[in-house]
Structures are given as structure tokens and as C-alpha cells.
């Protein structure tokens, strides 16, 4: 049976055993795997590898055996292992393969685990005595038997007949995502001072998770996913978002180099060597990761992760998964496969997608541009000197090469001709007896951001020109309109005449063509996240921040960004915490980035908020966010009450005191008032932000916040002996912006 | 002395609902995963459900047949399982039995409920 | 699913007969089967278990044999109180399957 590094199965035992014989025979190539569980409320067997040793834990009634295999015996390395225990008599034999391991005396008494046995894994047992147990089996065991009798036997769905082969798969296998819900969990991803991810990426799906860390602060991470068919990273951390995409359409069935960078000021995301990166805007402090590297699919924590997050993501897309397949997958520099996962779910070891994916003829056209990919420009004088032989035409005296290049000069987005002027050859052509056609052009590597666009029948396929087509304007330029000034293009140059000229240009010489893109500015745009309505609790405030609106400019770093609020300024709902009651008509994009800004309801229909953002040069089109304000619901969730020594004082925690609203993704004020005069004590609150030692004063009124932060108790201030349990009715009513639930 | 009391059954209209109810005493409850067994001429015996213990996070499997119908639960306070039944069809006529077992032997049963005879029709 | 097929679907035996009873898996059940007997109006109880292992209180005149795929269960000498109908069962994988039954009767 195949268990995934998720999984287990559960075995009844309803009656104390009072003999064991297990037989177990496991391969894992984990250091870590939970082999088996009894388990009872104190008695309980644990088998499980740990650091690659088997270690047996015994417990019975108050007495604790522990056995384990020696060191330098390593069971994790793949080969099927088998492990024998019994306890006969007062008296416990561990044997791995054959040999006597150890043995040891043992209480005579009957092992009670009315909890029943779990193979693999623990599933969701919570004991005192799990603590620090080994992860579950990724693995296969092949064999589980108790006095005789099969444990693996009814298999649950997620437990795979036999032994899936994906666990002895080298890492040059490739990751196969089968879907509907696969997934793959590694070692967390350090990115402490960068941090690289570089996989190659076969699929069709146009929307689907690539990877996930979450960070050690609630609320931070690192996604990458293909967003409409292109991939996109968005790094959340403390206040910041950053969203990055890149223009490579990648969901079309064909191998694309991928690789994320990430150091503390810069995030990249590069697809068949065609880099998008965040301007060096600061806000990637370092990310502590936390949990695993999820990679192809989410788990349920990650997908409420980024759906309480800024991205819009719905249900729908972050359960999704990928279907395609990851192969030369590394993290930080190193190889990672299969094997290594920590756990798997729906993944095949190998790259089988649908059928019609894999004819041999759909990568015959890739193989044809396989030379047009772009690559790291290889650091070399290009062209090489040619070196003329002997006995040639006077016109080749001191001939290294035929064409004096200049850089191609195109605007952001824009088209430019191909001239004379860019290729200039270094000899007079009629002396050298060589016709302008002659001179042939091939294109061996296009441009990262853009294309030669060829006016000439059938040359666009072949990608390639003669100078006679230069001179008649058939070659230009076309731009892809994206921010990077500096691009080239590859042209190798023969020429096809048959009269004496060296050698060189019958074999051809490859030269670089700088091109230079003249930026144009592009305006900025305004985007909702989570889409264009905002609700809020009528007279309460709501932080205004990017998880609300965002401000998209691909040439412009958030410092440059203004934001105006159009409209009449009188009664305008937009205000700076620190500034309450006075409207910001204007904000900057960093101030928005802080979260220092609020919108603030003070009855009637809400406003709707109409923004503009400029980048100092061009303005966005306006944008409106409708927000919709609705009546505070109050629901009293707990209240406990306190039981307390006379004279002693107790906290009001939540568990005993706390209410819930119809709030949307806003953490309201809410305020607890007391309405009626106290008998036996007092009500205090603790100044100074709740700093130890800080004094705890009187109060009749407190917020939710306050007893959340543990700065709220009740002191007992009676000082007469009673014959029975004094009983204080604390009456309270709860205020969230105008609304009040009394008699609580 | 084993005994598992069954109470619940009776005539319903297709489309409607029923909940049947399984006491059991003369064995610690809480520590025997429990099941639905139905039989009928047609279908002959035929598993239906199980929920399994606490520890277990009353782990819960259904026979496709009746997978989004039927609910099965459990209360160890009382010793009792319990088999709630929604959009009943003809199909689910047959006497139902609750049944038991608690031991790493197999999944056989190994202690019957008298059965209670459900019958759907207009 | 995994299904059961029993043989003979009845059985007309007398007292003092050696009966046997056959029970087919569709699929490789290894040993995880398991034998029932029901007589009219009552409960089925459990004969045997992981195909050939007495249940407690059985008669040591009903035994159980196989593996894999086709298993037997055996009356050495039938009573009276044995006329009924038996039942197979697996266990190896959900939905736990149960055969069409054996229904013996007095010849």
C-alpha cells in the first residue's frame, strides 16, 4: 500500500490485546515516517523512523519501554525493510530484517488502545504523548499484520494499492500534476538572503497555482501561479504587496523554462529567459518561511491564506490545480524530485499529460525556433575576426569583417525599419564583384521583446533576408511595448556569391544588433483586488489599503504614485488616521501602501469613491468604488462568566467574554458598557497599553480589543464573610458604530 | 450480553425523510466503529455506512448509492447510532440493520441489530 | 466495486450431509472474507472470519478455506438447526460487498 505523507489507515481494537506479533515490511526514502500507532488514553505502541532509525515506544500502565536500531543502520534508503515485534509474556523482541535487534522485559499486563491502531499516520489525533512524533509514512508498506491479521485491509481511497513508483523516482523524473487536486509539498523555501526556484513547465491550464510559502507572520507569502495564462508572483509582506507578471503566455502545451528570484529588495520572475522584476522597491524584507513549499496545487490552509488576502483569488482557483507537469525542478540552487517531496497528492512520477499533448508533432514547431529562444547573451566580441587567406582581391586587404553595425533605435511599443545605416558593410560590394542580394541575413536568436517583421514572401518562416531587402525597407522592428531599454538581435551573415572572397563569409559571421528602446510613459491604471464594491458597518471606519485598491504602472516605482479623490471635497469620507475628521482629497501611493488611510461612514447612504492616480506625467482614467454601508449585526459568541476567590481579581478573556458582527474584511470597533452599579467588586482596565506592571484602574467601559490584549478583569472588593457563593450580574451593552444590544 | 436495539422505521413517501436509531449496551460503545446494513429481495444484503470512533474524527464512509441522502452519526453519551435518511426513493425499501465491529480481525460484523423495515411508496 | 458470487444459489441437503458452499471474488480479496448465516426473520450472524477462522461460540462443524479469489465454506455433517441462508462478505476494500446468498434446505 502507497501512503503519500498524508495519509493512514485506522484499525479497530475495541479489546486490551494481550500478545503481540506485528509484522511490518516498509520502504521510505524519508528520514521521518510514523509506521504505526496503538493507541489508547495512557497505553500506547509507536513504531516510526526517526533520522532514519527505527524506534519502538512501549507504554503500559505506568511502565515505558523504548527500543530502537542502531545508528549506523540507516532504513531509509528505499529498499523494503522488515520489521518484526513481538510481546510474549512478559517479554518484547524487535528483529529488522532478520536480525536480533533488542529485547527487553516488559509488564505482563494487557496493552489497552481502545483508540484503535493507525498505520502510516495519525490523522487528526491530538494526544499529550504524539508530541514530536515523526511526520506520516511516504512511503509504501507492503505488508502490515497484527497477530496474523492484515492492517491494510479495507484501503481508504487516498491509500494506494502496491507501491507507487513515483517513491523511487530519480530526480531527473519529472513532477506529473494529474489532477483535479495534486499537489506537492517540499522543505520550506529559504529566502533569508535570495532565493531562486527554477522548474521547467509543460501545461494547458490557463489559471493554477505553481508555488506557495508562507511566511512565519500570519498573513505573509510567496505565490506564484498562471494567472489568464501568464505567470504571476505576489509577494505579501507585513503591509506590502507586490504583484508581478510576466507577458510569456505559458498554457500552451509546451515546455517553458521558469526560474523566481527573490532577494530583499527585488522579486523576478523570468520565463525562457524573458525577465519581469519589481523595481528595487525595499518591501521584500527578509520572509521567514513557515510550513512547507507547496508546489502544482494548495492545501486548505493556504487556500484561506490568499483568500483572506489581496489577490481576489475565488474558491474555485485557489482549489484548483495544476495539470501539466514540472520537470528539472531546483530550490536555492538544488536538485529536487519526487523523492524528496514531502508529500504528494493525485501526482504521477513523469510528464503524461493528455493524450494529444504528447503526439511527437506537436513539438515539431518548437524544434524549428528552438534557436530563436533567447538565452544569457553569451560575453563575446561579436563578430569573430576574420582572418582572409592568402591570394585574394586587393579589396580584402585588412578585411576582419563585412559590416560595420549601429544600434536599431525603436520607441517603447513602437516599429523601426531595418536601414543601411545599422549594417553597413565595410567594403565597396561592386569592387568586391558582390551584389546587395547576395548578402544574406539570418536571424539565430530574436530579440527578448520584440520581432523582426519580414515584408518578403516565405521569409518570415525562415527568418531570413538579404541587404538588398534592407535597402528596399522589407526588414523593420516591431516592439512588444515592454520596460526594458536594451534588447538585441542575433543575425548571422554569408554571403552566396561565387567569386574570390574569404572564407569566412562563405561560412558566415554572426554579429550582434543593440537595440535601443526609447521608454514611453505609460499611464497608470487603478485596480480592485477583490473586485469594485466595499462593504461597511454604517458610522464605523474601514482601512482603505491595497487589498481595497491598488495603483498598476509598469514604469512607475510606488513613490511616484498620487492618488486624487474626485468629487466635492466637503463630507468626503476619506480621511488619514492621524488627521480624523479632515478629508484627503489627495494621498500618495505609499501612504496608501501604509495603511494610513480609512473611509469613514457617518450615516446615510454611503459614498461612492471615484479615484484617479497619476504618475506626474499622465493621469489613469477615473475608477469608482461603490461602497455599500449596512445596518451592524451583534451576536454575543461567549459569555462564560468567572468564578473567583473573594478578594482575588481574574481576567475577562475572550473564551469568556466576546461578540461577533457582519463585518466584511473590516475589524470594527466594538465597545462593552456597563449599565448597572456593582455589588461585590469592580470592573478595571490596565493603562499603558497593557505593559506588565502597568496600574489597573476602575472603568465602566472597555472594547473587544481590550479584553483580546488580556487588559480587562474583575477585582473583588467585598470584604464580608459570606456562608454561600456571592453571584455579581455584570450588565452590559455592546455598541458597534450606532447600534447597541443591551441587557447582555 | 450484547444487544443493539433498533428503533425508527415505518412507511415514507419518495422524496421525504426518516431517521432511524441503533442503542447499544453490553459493550463499551465508544470504542466499536459502527454500521448500516440494509437488505432487500432485489439487492440482497447491502453495506450502507460507517462512522468510526473519537479518535478517529468519526471518520465516516457511505456505498455510493446513497452517498449525499444519508447521514450517519453517532452519540457515545448515549451508546447510540443513528442513520438520517433524506430524499428517499423505492429503491431504499428494504429492513435496515445496525451492525458492529471492534476488533483489527476485519472489517466483518460481528453484532446485529434486530432490523427495521423501511418502506418507500406512494 | 468488488463483487461476490455465490454458488450454489440453493441447496436441497439432508441431515448428516457434507455441504459446501462456494464464494467467487471478482478481485483479489487475499483473505479478508468472511461467511454469515440467516435464518427467516432474524439478524444474520457471523460464522466465520478472515476465510477460515471460527467466529466464537461456532460449531467446529463449519469451516472456512481460501485466498484470492475464490474461497469455500464447508458443513462437515449438516443439523437440523443449519438449514438457513449463508452469506459471503469482503472486507478488502470499500464498499464492503456481500455475495447473493446460499439458501439450504431440507431435501
Known amino acids: 500500500a502507497s501512503f503519500f505523507g498524508e495519509n493512514h489507515l485506522e484499525v479497530p481494537v475495541a479489546t486490551a490485546l494481550t500478545d503481540i506479533d506485528l509484522q511490518l515490511q516498509f520502504s521510505t526514502s524519508q528520514p521521518e515516517a510514523l509506521l504505526l500507532l496503538a493507541a489508547g488514553p495512557a497505553d500506547h505502541l509507536l513504531l516510526q523512523l526517526y533520522s532514519g532509525r527505527l524506534q519502538v515506544r512501549l507504554v503500559l500502565g505506568q511502565e515505558e519501554l523504548r527500543l530502537q536500531t542502531p545508528a549506523e543502520t540507516l532504513l531509509s534508503d528505499s529498499i523494503p525493510h522488515t520489521v518484526v515485534l513481538t510481546v510474549v509474556e512478559g517479554w518484547a523482541t524487535l528483529s529488522v530484517d532478520g536480525f536480533l535487534n533488542a529485547s527487553s522485559a516488559v509488564p505482563g499486563a494487557p496493552l489497552e488502545v481502545p483508540y484503535g491502531l493507525f498505520v502510516g499516520g495519525t490523522g487528526t489525533l491530538g494526544l499529550p504523548y504524539l508530541r514530536g512524533t515523526s511526520r506520516p509514512l511516504r512511503g509504501c508498506l507492503h505488508a502490515a499484520t497484527l497477530n496474523g491479521r492484515s492492517l491494510l485491509r479495507p484501503l481508504t481511497p487516498d491509500v494506494h494499492e502496491g507501491c507507487a513508483e513515483e517513491f523511487s523516482a530519480s530526480d531527473d523524473v519529472a513532477l506529473g500534476f494529474s489532477g483535479p487536486h495534486s499537489l506537492a509539498a517540499f522543505p520550506a523555501w529559504g529566502t533569508q538572503d535570495e532565493g531562486t526556484l527554477e522548474f521547467t513547465l509543460t501545461t494547458q491550464s490557463r489559471q493554477a497555482p505553481l508555488a506557495f510559502q508562507a511566511g512565519g507572520r500570519r498573513g505573509d507569502f510567496i505565490y506564484v501561479d498562471i494567472f489568464e495564462g501568464h505567470l504571476r508572483a505576489v509577494v505579501e509582506k507585513g503591509q506590502g504587496t507586490v504583484l508581478l507578471h510576466n507577458s510569456v503566455p505559458v498554457a500552451d502545451g509546451q515546455p517553458h523554462e521558469v526560474s523566481v528570484h527573490i532577494n530583499a529588495h527585488r522579486l523576478e520572475i523570468s520565463v525562457d529567459q524573458y525577465p519581469t522584476h519589481t523595481s528595487n522597491r525595499g518591501v521584500l524584507s527578509y520572509l521567514e518561511p513557515r510550513g512547507s513549499l507547496l508546489l502544482g496545487g494548495l492545501d486548505a490552509e493556504a487556500s484561506r491564506h490568499l483568500q483572506e488576502h489581496r489577490l481576489g483569488l475565488t474558491p474555485e482557483a485557489t482549489n484548483a490545480s495544476l495539470l501539466g507537469c514540472m520537470e528539472d525542478l531546483s530550490v536555492n540552487g538544488q536538485r529536487r524530485g519526487l523523492r524528496e517531496a514531502l508529500l504528494t497528492r493525485n501526482m504521477a512520477a513523469g510528464c503524461r499529460l493528455e493524450e494529444e499533448e504528447y503526439e511527437d508533432d506537436a513539438y515539431g514547431h518548437y524544434e524549428a525556433f528552438s534557436t530563436l529562444a533567447p538565452e544569457a547573451w553569451p560575453a563575446m566580441e561579436l563578430p569573430e575576426p576574420c582572418v582572409p587567406e592568402p591570394g585574394l582581391p586587393p579589396v580584402f586587404a585588412n578585411f576582419t569583417q563585412l559590416l560595420t553595425i549601429s544600434p536599431l533605435v525603436v520607441a517603447e511599443g513602437g516599429t523601426a525599419w531595418l536601414e543601411w545605416r545599422h549594417v553597413q558593410p565595410t567594403l565597396d560590394l561592386m569592387e568586391a564583384e558582390l551584389r546587395k542580394s547576395q548578402v544574406l541575413f539570418s536571424v539565430t536568436r530574436g530579440a527578448r521583446h520584440g520581432e523582426l517583421e519580414l515584408d518578403i514572401p516565405g521569409a518570415q518562416a525562415r527568418k531570413m533576408f538579404t541587404l538588398l531587402d534592407v535597402v528596399n525597407r522589407k526588414a523593420r522592428f516591431i516592439h512588444d511595448g515592454s520596460e526594458d531599454t536594451s534588447d538585441q538581435l542575433v543575425l548571422e551573415v554569408s554571403v552566396t556569391a561565387r567569386v574570390p572572397m574569404p572564407s569566412c563569409l562563405r561560412r558566415g559571421q554572426t554579429y550582434l544588433l543593440p537595440i535601443q528602446v526609447n521608454p514611453v510613459n505609460d499611464p497608470p491604471h487603478i485596480i480592485f483586488p477583490h473586485g469594485s464594491l466595499m462593504v461597511i458597518l454604517e458610522h464605523t471606519q474601514k482601512p482603505l489599503g491595497p487589498e481595497v485598491f491598488q495603483a498598476y504602472d509598469p514604469d512607475s516605482a510606488c513613490e511616484g504614485l498620487t492618488f486624487q479623490v474626485l468629487g466635492t471635497s466637503s463630507g468626503l469620507p476619506v480621511e488619514r488616521r492621524d488627521q480624523p475628521g479632515e478629508p484627503a482629497t489627495e494621498f500618495s501611493c505609499r501612504e496608501l501602501e501604509a495603511g494610513s488611510l480609512v473611509y469613514v461612514h457617518r450615516g446615510g447612504p454611503a459614498q461612492d469613491l471615484t479615484f484617479r492616480v497619476s504618475d506626474g506625467l499622465q493621469a489613469s482614467p477615473p475608477a469608482t468604488l461603490k461602497v455599500v454601508a449596512i445596518r451592524p449585526a451583534i451576536q454575543i459568541h461567549r459569555s462564560t462568566g468567572l468564578r473567583l476567590a473573594q478578594g482575588s481579581a481574574m481576567p475577562i478573556l475572550p473564551a469568556n467574554l466576546s461578540v461577533e458582527t457582519n463585518a466584511v474584511g473590516q475589524d470594527v470597533s466594538v465597545l462593552f458598557r456597563v449599565t448597572g452599579a456593582l455589588q461585590f467588586g469592580e470592573l478595571q482596565k490596565q493603562g499603558a497599553g497593557g505593559v506588565e506592571g502597568a496600574e489597573w484602574w476602575a472603568t465602566q467601559a472597555f472594547h473587544q480589543r481590550d479584553v483580546e490584549q488580556g487588559r480587562v478583569r474583575y477585582l473583588s472588593t467585598d470584604p464580608q464573610h459570606h456562608a454561600y457563593d456571592t453571584v455579581e450580574n455584570l450588565a452590559l451593552e455592546v455598541q458597534v458604530g450606532q447600534e447597541i444590544l443591551s441587557n447582555l | 450480553q450484547v444487544k443493539l436495539q433498533q428503533s425508527g422505521g415505518g412507511l415514507v413517501q419518495p422524496g421525504g425523510s426518516m431517521k432511524l436509531s441503533c442503542v447499544v449496551s453490553?459493550?463499551?460503545?465508544?470504542?466499536?466503529?459502527m454500521n448500516w446494513v440494509r437488505q432487500s429481495p432485489e439487492k440482497g444484503l447491502e453495506w450502507i455506512a460507517e462512522?468510526?470512533?473519537?479518535?478517529?474524527?468519526?471518520?465516516?464512509y457511505y456505498a455510493e448509492s446513497v452517498k449525499g441522502r444519508f447521514t450517519i452519526s453517532r452519540d457515545d453519551s448515549k451508546s447510540s447510532a443513528y442513520l438520517q435518511m433524506i430524499n428517499l426513493r423505492a429503491e431504499d425499501t428494504g429492513i435496515y440493520y445496525c451492525?458492529?465491529?471492534?476488533?483489527?480481525?476485519?472489517?466483518?460484523?460481528?453484532?446485529w441489530g434486530q432490523g427495521t423495515t423501511v418502506t418507500v411508496s406512494s | 466495486d468488488i463483487q461476490l458470487t455465490q454458488s450454489p444459489s440453493f441447496l436441497s441437503a439432508s441431515v448428516g450431509d457434507r455441504v459446501t458452499i462456494t464464494c467467487r471474488a471478482s478481485?483479489?480479496?487475499?483473505?479478508?472474507l468472511a461467511w454469515y448465516q440467516q435464518k427467516p426473520g432474524q439478524a444474520p450472524r457471523p460464522l466465520i472470519y478472515?476465510?477460515?477462522y471460527r467466529y466464537t461460540g461456532v460449531p467446529s462443524r463449519f469451516s472456512g478455506s481460501g485466498s484470492g479469489t475464490e474461497f469455500t465454506l464447508t458443513i462437515s455433517s449438516l443439523q437440523p438447526e443449519d438449514f438457513a441462508t449463508y452469506y459471503c462478505?469482503?472486507?478488502?476494500?470499500?464498499?464492503?460487498?456481500f455475495g447473493g446468498g446460499t439458501k439450504v434446505e431440507i431435501k
Open positions: 451492525t458492529s465491529y471492534g476488533n483489527y480481525v476485519g472489517h466483518y460484523f460481528d453484532h
Open positions: 453490553g459493550f463499551t460503545f465508544s470504542n466499536y466503529w
Open positions: 462512522i468510526r470512533l473519537k479518535s478517529n474524527n468519526f471518520g465516516r
Open positions: 478481485q483479489n480479496v487475499d483473505t479478508n
Open positions: 478472515s476465510a477460515s
Open positions: 462478505q469482503q472486507y478488502n476494500s470499500y464498499p464492503l460487498t
